[in-house]
Structure formats: structure tokens, C-alpha cells
């Protein structure tokens, strides 16, 4: 049977004085020699040597110094051997217990925290937390952590409230005002015993977050400008306000805007986001003859919702502002700026000459009458095809054009008149499109196989050729209707998709017949005019050569019929 | 692989104090203890005492107690072995010796190449 | 302290042939975490020691499956079962059961 006793150690002092701290006998010892051995951590394993052990008593000794933070206890395993180096016990698992001693301050896990509140915070509300250990015995005084504000920066009323075991930063009161103090440092102190044993100190930052519970308010209490009528501005006015909320933050941003006066939409406010300034922008001219003073209202207001500390207490506050409109000799304008003309449909490109379109006259803007003592010309004029009259302002074409005209775009063309006053010289412009129909002066024309045909079989083939491949096959081929007191002479009958055959439906007497095919193609496109065909029908020999041509004067030219004209 | 080298060979006169240093390759320095052995000419092998790295807390024979140091230097992975009050008796070949268990530590399963040290007036 | 002593002193073998080298210990090896630390080396002429067995019987790595180990409590064998010419030199047990460690005093293995 093991008998045992073992004195607990306190760290950081000399125990041996104490010594022996520990004593194992085996009761074996009575009536054999019995060697003791002890083993563990602070013996045979690392920190080597702190115990030993008198084989022979089995007291036990201690030689170092031991730190209770490193080594709470020790377990010491005991053995009692015999003579023959055999265990006479059972090992012994032996227990020495370090006392702790105060060697260790508490330790913040920051040196410097940081945190953050919105001005006028209910009070109690929380900044942070502290957090620091001690690593001094858990749950003895030794360890037990009191924290303490030291100091507030700035000094005066105490703003923040420490809780003495948790570490909580708190607000004291409701009243943080971020436009008197916009960051507050604390030293806060943490001392173990509760308070009365080591500390150490660590700083707290805190920053009082702006709220938007400031007005931003007009510097002066009415504004004035004036601006001549007819003209815009991008700077007529700067409304200066003052805003105590933090600066280019959307609490001290303004939003200016009208209260009265700007039903027409002429001004604009826009904010300067640097100065949060308001700048005043004429948008819309302004016509003295119809205003010649606007009285304004304007109101601010913040980009951001006021906070709801003080959104009770917002009232739209409007201050007024007087802008003299200045009158101004206007002269002449065109009014509407642009006109259309069209051009009406079924005339020939070949035939615009002189094809007056209307007439564009300038305005008086003082009296809004047509202007007179003015002088019309004409402007930009690609191509040359208009013409105004200076005094009328009639316009007319004065060339002709060709279909495919570079000028005309999306079937308009393009040109400026000007009119001038006689007495400024002061010109005013006015924009003229016109718009011209399709004129299929490339429509497809039509061809035929030969040019003289037997006057006993007379047949020929007519094949259609296009110039700009604008029209596509395949083709229709028609007579142009005739007169319906002449019987119908000639025929035609589609062959393929570009020709056709013509032929006359009785015999004919000899001579040069003129006949009219009308050529429409598959989009519907047909020619502004009919195809004139001119064929020779002559009295051929046995071999089927013309034979004596036939005077031209008689019987004469004929068309589609001998002796009869259109 | 695992490597202890030792400084060289050195003279000291009776009285004065050796320092024999070893260092350790691989990245478990602080893993292992570390002993010191020292072998008379012509003599058996002689336990000097063991360091643990990682606290530095150390454990000498008897017979060396008093006269012995052992330290180490964490940073360059170094041992050293200091002895005091040399007399001829403490010529020998000093080994320094790492243990193959992180534990118990109680084989020495690498050795250094031995370090010569001769006290003679 | 812990004595260790080592029969023979001196082994004079025939190339070979197997080889015995016992060691006892004044009192018993077994350690409290149950272990037994006994080991043995080799330690050629001029050269450092180097370690053969561990913990009675475990082959270091490297070493030749002819060397072998046994025994308990205070007593020991290192056993050779073919001496080759490389196996010339001094051999050790080494008790690490407590502090302070101990050696043997040697056992010279030559060949006859």
C-alpha cells in the first residue's frame, strides 16, 4: 500500500526551502529495500529536472522555479521496485498542484479599437466591445478583469459609459453631435484583481457618423438677375447655402427645385457638387413680348431624407427670385425653322423645270407677321436645282434631275434659304426639304430581234433590257391600250421572262409602224412613259428579203394601224 | 534527412570552459530533444545531459551538475554544450545526439560527427 | 543511477557465423508509459555511433535484418545471425528508462 502526501507549489518563487514538497513510501518497506523512480513532465519530460526523488526515502524534491502558466499541475508517476528491479506497487499517479501568483496583466487583443455611432444615438446604445484576457488563473481574482474610461478626448461631459466587467462601450446620453465632435478617443484602462491589481491601457477610436438632422439653408433672403429675352444660360444665378451636416456626403448635398413661378419650364437648378452651390440655367428662352419679369420661388432640401430627428421641424421655406427679362430687336426668323415641299407625283424628272413649289416666307418675330424689307437667296443648294425669288420667297426648280441624283436622300433632297434684313443685314435661315417621287427614268426598254419584218408573216421578238438592274424580271409586256374606235392590229405574247412575241393579228400593209409596250416588272415598277417600238413591215420576194422600200411619205409613218396616227 | 554538424576540433587549457556547438538541418528543430555524450580516448560512451528545444529546460548527470550548460539558439537552429573548470579529464570527443521520437525522446537515433576537445597545459 | 553491464567484453567470431552479446541492468527498464528503453549500437573505429535496435527489439532504419533484439525487464541480448566483415567494432546497450541515461561498457566484436 502506497503512502503519500503532496504540499502544492506557488509559481515564481523558491519552493525548495520546502522541501521535501512530496513523499511516496510503499508499505513493502517494513521488510525489503524498496528504490523509488518517479517519471513524467518536469522529470524525464520536458522542462526536464524539475523534481527528483531520494531512491532510497522517496522524498521528493523540487529544484526550479515553476511557472503556473506554462504548467498548471503536475503528474508525477511514482514506482516502488524491489530488490530484482521488479514493481512492487501499482504505479502512483501523484498530483502537485501550482499555486498561481498575480505575475501577468491583462492584455488587450487591440492596442487601438475602433468604432463607429451615428450622432444622436438613444443613450445606451452600443460602440463596441473591449476585449482582453489575463492569463492568470481562469476564474480567480488574479484574472478577473475591471475596465475604466481614463481619459475622453475632447474632455467635458462624458459621452461614454464602460461596463466595469463586460468591456462595453455605451453611449451616456442621446445627445453625440457629430457638428460639435466628429471622433472621440478614450483611454481605457483594464486591471486585474478586479481592478486593484496589474492593468494595462489601450485606446478606443470612435467616430461619430454624420446624420442628416441639419437644414441646408439660403445665405441670403431673395436673389435677382436679369437676362435679355431669346437666349439661353448655363449660369445666370449661384444660390450660395449653408449646410452644417459632414460635407460631399448626401446629408449636406442640396437638391434645389421651384416652389412657383417656372410653369413654362424655362429655368433649371442644377447643384454644383463642389460648392453645393445651385446654379440657375435658363433652358428655355424667354420672350419679352409675352414676359418681361418672372418672379421665382425656391426651396433646398438635401439629397438625403432629413433624419427623423428633426424632420418634424422641416418646413419648405421658399425664397424669391426676380429675373428682368431685357428686350432685345429681334429681327426676322423662319417659323417653323424647316418646311416640306413635295413634289407632285406623275411629273418626269425631265420636266421640273420652272415646277414651282411653294413659297417660305421669314417672319417679323417683334410683330409675328411676314417680314418685309427683307431679301430672300438661297442657302446651301447641292446640285442647283432651287431658286427662291427675293422678294416673294417663291421657290421653283430651275434645272432638272436625274433619278439617281446624289442629292436625293431617302427621296428628299435637301437645301437653306436665307432671308435677309435690308436694314441689319442680320440673316436668318430656314431649311427646305423637298420631297420627289420615283422617277423611273431607268425603267427597262425594250428591244426587238430585227427591225423589218414581212409584210405576209408579220412576227417579231421583243426582249426587255434593264440599264441599273433596279428592276428585276420577270417581265409583263403590254400594248398600250389604243383608241376603242380602232380595231386592235398587233398582239403580244409572253415568251420567257424577259422577251415576248409581237406580231400583227391580220395582214398589213407595208410601211413603219410605231407601237406603244407598256413593260411592268415583278415589284409593280413600270415605266412613266410607254416604250415607243418602231418596225419596219415590208413586201418581201420568194427568198424572204425586203424588196423596194416604199416612199416615206406615203402611206406615210404609221402607228399600230396604215393611216391612222394617235 | 536529418543532420547534426558540429564545430571543430579546439586546445583549452585546465581551468578554462569549452563551448562545442551543433546544428540541426530539417524544420523540426523544436520537435526533438537533443543529448550530449563525450567519449574518453580509448574509453565507453558517457551521458551528459539532454535539452528540450522548444523551452529550453535542460536535465545534466550528476557528476556534470555545476559545470555544464546547455542552451540553444532557436533562430539558426543551433545547440551548444559549454563546459566549465576543464581538466584532463574532460578530453574526449563530445557528440552531440537527437532522438527519433517527438515525445518521450528517448532514442538517440542521429549523431553528430563528434567534436575533439583537448585540455592540456 | 541505473548500472548497465555488458558479457563479453571482447567477441572474437569467425566470419559467418552468428554472434551474442547480452546486457543487464541493475534494476528493471520498464518505464510507467509501459515501454522499455533499451537500445543498442555500433560504433566503428573513428567513427560516431550509430543506433542498431530500440525499445529492445525495433530495427533502426537501414540496418540489416541480421541484427536482432530481445530480452525484458533487466535483461538483454543483441544477436547477429552472419558476422560480416563490416560488423567490426564497439558495441553499446543504452538504457533511457530514467535519467540519468547509462551506457554499457562495450563489447568489441573482432573477427578471429
Known amino acids: 500500500e502506497w503512502v503519500k502526501f503532496a504540499k502544492p507549489c506557488r509559481e515564481g518563487e523558491d519552493n525548495s526551502k520546502r522541501n521535501p514538497i512530496a513523499k511516496i513510501t510503499s508499505d513493502y518497506q517494513a521488510t525489503q529495500k524498496i528504490t523509488y523512480r518517479i517519471s513524467g513532465v518536469g522529470i524525464d519530460q520536458p522542462p526536464f529536472g524539475i523534481f527528483v526523488v531520494d531512491k532510497n526515502t522517496g522524498d521528493i524534491n523540487i529544484t526550479a522555479i515553476v511557472d503556473r502558466e506554462e504548467t498548471p499541475s503536475f503528474l508525477i508517476t511514482c514506482r516502488a521496485l524491489n530488490a530484482q528491479g521488479l514493481d512492487v506497487e501499482k504505479p502512483l499517479i501523484l498530483t502537485v498542484k501550482i499555486l498561481d501568483i498575480n505575475d501577468n496583466p491583462p492584455v488587450f487583443s487591440q492596442q487601438i479599437f475602433m468604432g463607429e455611432i451615428e450622432e444622436n444615438s438613444a443613450s445606451n446604445s452600443l460602440v463596441m466591445i473591449l476585449n482582453a484576457t489575463d492569463a492568470d488563473e481562469p476564474n480567480h481574482l488574479n484574472s478577473k478583469i475591471a475596465f475604466k474610461i481614463v481619459s475622453q478626448e475632447p474632455a467635458g461631459t462624458p459621452m461614454f459609459l464602460l461596463s466595469r466587467n463586460t468591456g462595453e462601450v455605451r453611449t451616456l446620453t442621446n445627445s453625440l453631435d457629430r457638428e460639435q465632435a466628429s471622433s472621440y478617443r478614450l483611454v481605457v484602462s483594464g486591471a486585474d484583481k478586479d481592478g486593484e491589481g496589474l492593468s494595462t491601457q489601450c485606446e478606443c477610436n470612435i467616430k461619430v457618423k454624420d446624420v442628416n438632422d441639419n437644414f441646408p439653408m439660403f445665405r441670403d433672403s431673395q436673389y435677382s438677375a436679369r437676362i435679355e429675352e431669346n437666349i439661353l444660360s448655363s449660369e445666370l444665378l449661384r444660390f450660395q447655402v449653408t449646410d452644417l451636416d459632414e460635407e460631399y456626403t448626401d446629408n449636406w448635398l442640396a437638391v434645389y427645385f421651384f416652389t412657383s413661378g417656372n410653369e413654362g419650364n424655362w429655368f433649371e437648378i442644377q447643384t454644383d457638387p463642389r460648392t453645393n452651390e445651385g446654379i440657375l440655367k435658363v433652358v428655355k428662352a424667354l420672350d419679352y413680348e409675352q414676359l418681361q419679369s418672372v418672379k421665382l420661388s425656391i426651396a433646398v432640401k438635401n439629397k438625403a431624407e432629413f433624419h427623423q430627428s428633426v424632420i418634424s421641424r422641416y418646413r419648405v421655406q421658399s425664397t424669391p427670385v426676380t429675373i428682368q427679362v431685357i428686350n432685345v430687336r429681334e429681327g426676322i426668323a423662319f417659323r417653323p425653322a424647316s418646311k416640306t415641299f413635295t413634289v407632285q407625283k406623275g411629273i418626269s424628272s425631265k420636266k421640273l423645270v420652272d415646277y414651282i413649289l411653294g413659297t417660305y416666307q421669314a417672319i417679323d418675330e417683334d410683330t409675328n407677321k411676314a417680314a418685309s424689307n427683307v431679301k430672300y437667296v438661297m442657302g446651301r443648294n447641292d446640285g442647283g436645282y432651287l431658286m427662291i425669288d427675293s422678294k416673294t420667297a417663291e421657290i421653283k426648280f430651275v434645272k432638272n434631275m436625274n433619278r439617281d441624283s446624289t442629292f436625293i436622300v431617302n427621296k428628299t433632297i435637301t437645301a437653306e434659304v436665307l432671308a435677309i434684313d435690308e436694314y441689319t443685314g442680320k440673316t436668318s435661315t430656314g431649311t427646305v426639304y423637298v420631297r420627289v417621287p420615283d422617277f423611273n427614268d431607268n425603267c427597262p426598254t425594250a428591244v426587238l430581234e430585227k427591225d423589218a419584218v414581212c409584210s405576209s408573216s408579220p412576227s417579231v421578238v421583243v426582249s426587255a433590257r434593264t440599264l441599273n438592274n433596279r428592276y428585276t424580271g420577270p417581265y409583263t409586256f403590254a400594248l398600250e391600250d389604243q383608241p376603242v374606235k380602232l380595231p386592235a392590229v398587233w398582239s403580244i405574247t409572253t415568251l420567257n421572262a424577259t422577251s415576248a412575241l409581237l406580231r400583227a393579228q391580220e395582214q398589213i400593209p407595208p410601211g413603219v409602224y410605231h407601237i406603244s409596250l407598256v413593260l411592268t416588272d415583278s415589284q409593280n415598277n413600270r415605266c412613266e412613259m410607254p416604250r415607243s417600238l418602231t418596225l419596219e413591215v415590208c413586201q418581201c420576194d420568194n427568198r424572204g428579203i425586203c424588196g423596194t422600200s416604199y416612199p416615206t411619205t406615203s402611206p406615210g409613218t404609221r402607228y399600230g394601224r396604215p393611216h391612222s396616227g394617235r | 534527412q536529418v543532420q547534426l554538424v558540429q564545430s571543430g576540433a579546439d586546445v583549452k587549457k585546465p581551468g578554462a570552459s569549452v563551448k562545442v556547438s551543433c546544428t540541426a538541418s530539417?524544420?523540426?528543430?523544436?520537435?526533438?530533444?537533443l543529448h550530449w555524450v563525450r567519449q574518453a580516448p580509448g574509453q565507453g560512451l558517457e551521458w551528459m545531459g539532454v535539452?528540450?528545444?522548444?523551452?529550453?529546460?535542460?536535465s545534466y548527470a550528476q557528476k556534470f551538475q555545476g559545470r555544464l550548460t546547455m542552451t540553444r539558439d532557436t533562430s539558426t537552429s543551433t545547440f551548444y554544450m559549454e563546459l566549465s573548470s576543464l581538466r584532463s579529464e574532460d578530453t574526449a570527443v563530445y557528440y552531440c545526439?537527437?532522438?527519433?521520437?517527438?515525445?518521450?525522446?528517448?532514442?538517440?537515433?542521429?549523431w553528430g560527427q563528434g567534436t575533439l576537445v583537448t585540455v592540456s597545459s | 543511477d541505473i548500472v548497465m553491464t555488458q558479457t563479453p567484453l571482447s567477441s572474437p567470431v569467425t566470419l559467418g557465423q552468428p554472434a551474442s552479446i547480452s546486457c543487464r541492468s541493475s534494476e528493471t527498464l520498464v518505464h510507467s508509459d509501459g515501454n522499455t528503453y533499451l537500445s543498442w549500437l555500433q560504433q566503428r573505429p573513428g567513427q560516431p555511433p550509430r543506433l542498431l535496435i530500440y525499445k529492445i527489439s525495433n530495427r533502426f532504419s537501414g540496418v540489416p535484418d541480421r541484427f536482432s533484439g530481445s530480452g525484458a525487464g533487466t535483461d538483454f541480448t543483441l544477436k547477429i545471425s552472419r558476422v560480416e566483415a563490416e560488423d567490426v567494432g564497439v558495441y553499446y546497450c543504452l538504457q533511457a528508462t530514467e535519467f540519468p541515461y547509462t551506457f554499457g561498457q562495450g563489447t568489441k566484436l573482432e573477427i578471429k
Open positions: 545526439a537527437r532522438s527519433i521520437e517527438s515525445i518521450s525522446g528517448r532514442t538517440l537515433g542521429y
Open positions: 530539417g524544420n523540426t528543430f523544436t520537435t526533438y530533444s
Open positions: 535539452i528540450d528545444p522548444s523551452g529550453g529546460s535542460t
